[in-house]
């Protein structure tokens, strides 16, 4: 969960407890198990590149 | 350019613990994933467990839950594994790896492994 | 937790000739993204463990376009088009796809 008095993610992105910030939707990509990627299933990601494990 | 060096070979009596050290250069330590992985002689690679630097936070393989404790430390952007309760089981290289969670990632990176001998 | 296992455990290489090391999976690692999460390491003789081929079919930087790889959901394949010496050492399939992270049990290549 976010946490209080956080301002809210932008748009394409969702927040990370793993990394204590917000996180772009596209990383999901890379790694679809992060704990942010829950955030980002409702919302397409922004533009992104091939990735790295 | 990015480099993870691992700290030098151990022997050790089993029962006793040792710490392994991962220092990372060349980039942002907060901002990736150390994992930690176990290649006991002849043997091929098994994942010991990960760690979030940044935040501490942790995730283990069942396997390894109560042998292995990871930290790290921020200030000197060093990764830490520390194995309990040592037995001769637990003879292996072990080696640390950055993981990433981005998705403009350029490759990934292993240190150089530590050999760790346990024996009476 | 996923299992990787690969065949065959032992590869006897002729340098120029090519060769072929396959892996399946005990589950689909195609995503519901597109993405199919299987990736490809050497680990050289001595050496750590390098990557050679991400996301299935992706070579990493650096990385001779002699290797290349493809396969399905759960049926994967490394193929080396024409072996160099340089190429020996175990070769691993692991997956990204959750956690546990878990590897094959590595196939080892060497020269005839």
């Known amino acids: 969960e976010q946490a209080p008095g956080t301002a809210p993610c932008s748009r394409g992105s969702s927040w990370s407890a793993d990394l204590d910030k917000c996180m772009d939707c596209a990383s999901c990509r890379a790694r679809p198990h992060s704990d942010f990627c829950l955030g980002c299933a409702a919302a397409p990601p922004a533009p992104f590149r091939l990735l790295w494990p | 350019q990015v480099q993870l060096v691992q700290s030098g070979a151990e022997v050790k009596k089993p029962g006793a613990s040792v710490k392994v050290s991962c220092k990372a250069s060349g980039y942002t330590f907060t901002d990736f994933i150390i994992a930690w992985v176990k290649q006991a002689p002849g043997q091929g690679l098994e994942w010991i467990g990960e760690?979030?630097?940044?935040?501490?936070?942790?995730y283990y393989s069942e396997k390894f839950r109560g042998k292995a404790t990871l930290t790290a430390d921020t200030s000197t952007s060093t990764a830490y594994m520390e194995l309990s309760s040592l037995r001769s089981e637990d003879t292996a290289v072990y080696f640390c790896?950055?993981?990433?969670?981005?998705?403009?990632?350029?490759?990934?990176?292993w240190g150089q492994g530590t050999l760790v001998t346990v024996s009476s | 937790d996923i299992v990787m296992t690969q065949s065959p455990l032992s590869l006897p290489v002729t340098p120029g000739e090519p060769a072929s090391i396959s892996c399946r999976s005990s589950q689909s690692l195609l995503h519901s993204n597109g993405i199919t999460y299987l990736y490809w390491y050497l680990q050289k003789p001595g050496q750590s463990p390098q990557l050679l081929i991400y996301q299935m079919s992706n070579r990493a930087s650096g990385v001779p376009d002699r290797f290349s790889g493809s396969g399905s959901g759960t049926d994967f394949t490394l193929k080396i088009s024409r072996v160099e010496a340089e190429d020996v050492g175990v070769y691993y399939c692991?997956?990204?796809?959750?956690?546990?992270?878990?590897f094959g049990q590595g196939t080892k290549v060497e020269i005839k």
């Open positions: 760690i979030y630097p940044g935040t501490g936070r942790t």
């Open positions: 790896a950055r993981r990433t969670i981005y998705y403009d990632y350029d490759g990934d990176y």
């Open positions: 692991a997956h990204n796809l959750e956690l546990p992270w878990t």
